[in-house]
């Protein structure tokens, strides 16, 4: 069964800056990745970035840099400097559309007691939806 993992990390150098990393554990080819803030994409969250393998990357504030890390994982840096940055309990979700598996989504947030710059290794988050 495919899985999606989500890792949220606060940067040590910029305490209000977050890095979100997401990955897809499956054999299909990814056609689209959507990262959202506040809840699942299309069901409670607002879109931060949309990454398409061929059509490129779109991002919205407070996303600062979205990029592909591998063919099946992405990373997204949120702007910091105190300019309306998210709180530590903020929910971030990643939705992967792949063929032939369909859409798989998981959410994560910063561990409550995590030190800046430190985070647990990425683990599969609970899968919220499989369309």
């Amino acid at each position: 069964t495919p899985e999606v993992w989500v890792q949220v990390r606060m940067e040590a150098t910029e305490l209000s800056s977050f890095t979100i990393r997401c990955g897809f554990l499956g054999s299909g080819s990814i056609s689209l990745v959507t990262v959202s803030w506040g809840g699942p994409n299309g069901a409670g969250g607002t879109t931060l970035a949309v990454l398409h393998p061929e059509r490129g990357i779109r991002q919205w504030a407070p996303a600062r840099q979205a990029r592909w890390e591998t063919q099946s994982s992405i990373s997204l840096i949120l702007e910091g400097s105190g300019a309306s940055s998210p709180c530590a309990n903020t929910t971030f979700c990643c939705k992967f559309a792949s063929f032939p598996e369909g859409s798989w989504e998981a959410c994560g947030s910063l561990p409550p007691s995590s030190d800046p710059g430190l985070s647990a290794p990425p683990t599969p988050a609970p899968i919220l939806r499989a369309d």
């Epitope: 506040g38 809840g39 409670g44 607002t46 879109t47 779109r58 919205w60 504030a61 300019a83 309990n89």
Partner: antibody, heavy 118, light 106 residues
Framework: QVQLQQSGPELVRPGVSVKISCKVS????????MHWVKQSHAKSLEWIGI????????NYNQNFKGKATMTVDKSSSTAYMALARLTSEDSAIYYC???????????WGQGTLVTVSA | QIVLTQSPTIMSASPGEKVTMTCSAS?????IYWYQQNPGSSPRLLIY???ILASGVPFRFSGSGSGTSYSLTISRMEAEDAATYYC?????????FGSGTKLELK
């Protein structure tokens, strides 16, 4: 159809607080984030912040931290914004605005006029 | 924060006339959104992603631009277009709006 119904006008004394509401209908409240926007003669339109009714997560414009507090009540599909320690500079029309399927202010409430006067 | 400067502040046009207003950003933005506001009404989404018309918006409206320079054009002015127009960016928090261009009917 999507509707955002805001509470009526408020005439308040300086130093007090006020809480305005935005009751939604025509869609599932927790499916879309809500924004609040201030409109005054002095500064045109100013974004106050965003709240996710799904998670309760908020994000504020630094200029309104300590001034505005956004909350939601899922049971009544209503978003609220409280404004603290009002001064004449807070006199304005306040709008709630819902996003579309992508980030944009697709739907707006009719606005709530807040007048601060001694 | 990104400052959006709209010009002109006020302009007037006769019915059928072509109208162009601009929005200049203090630093590069990915897209611009345009809103129309009639007196006593709430703002209404007109154009998103710089050039895409929102639902129900007449085809006489168009948007263009990139980087720091954007514009809104009305190909043929109509009486109902008399309103104030605001540009807005979603590239960086805090989200910001321009100060508006008031379009009057001549």
């Amino acid at each position: 159809q999507v509707q955002l119904q805001q509470s009526g006008p408020e005439l308040v004394r300086p130093g007090v607080s006020v809480k305005i509401s935005c009751k939604v209908s025509g869609y599932t409240f927790t499916d879309y984030v809500m924004h609040w926007v201030k409109q005054s003669h002095a500064k045109s339109l100013e974004w106050i912040g965003i709240i996710s009714p799904y998670s309760g997560n908020t994000n504020y414009n630094q200029n309104f931290k300590g001034k505005a507090t956004m909350t939601v009540d899922k049971s009544s599909s209503t978003a609220y914004m409280a404004l603290a320690r009002l001064t004449s500079e807070d006199s304005a029309i306040y709008y709630c605005a819902r996003e579309g399927d992508l980030p944009m202010f697709a739907y707006w409430g009719q606005g709530t006029l807040v007048t601060v006067s001694a | 924060q990104i400052v959006l400067t709209q010009s002109p502040t006020i302009m007037s046009a006769s019915p059928g006339e072509k109208v162009t207003m601009t929005c200049s950003a203090s630093s590069s933005v990915s897209y611009i959104y345009w809103y129309q506001q009639n007196p006593g009404s709430s703002p209404r989404l007109l154009i998103y992603d710089t050039s895409i018309l929102a639902s129900g918006v007449p085809f006489r409206f168009s948007g263009s631009g990139s980087g720091t320079s954007y514009s809104l054009t009305i190909s043929r002015m109509e009486a109902e277009d008399a309103a104030t127009y605001y540009c807005q960016q979603w590239t960086s928090y805090p989200l910001t709006f321009g100060s508006g261009t008031k379009l009057e009917l001549k």
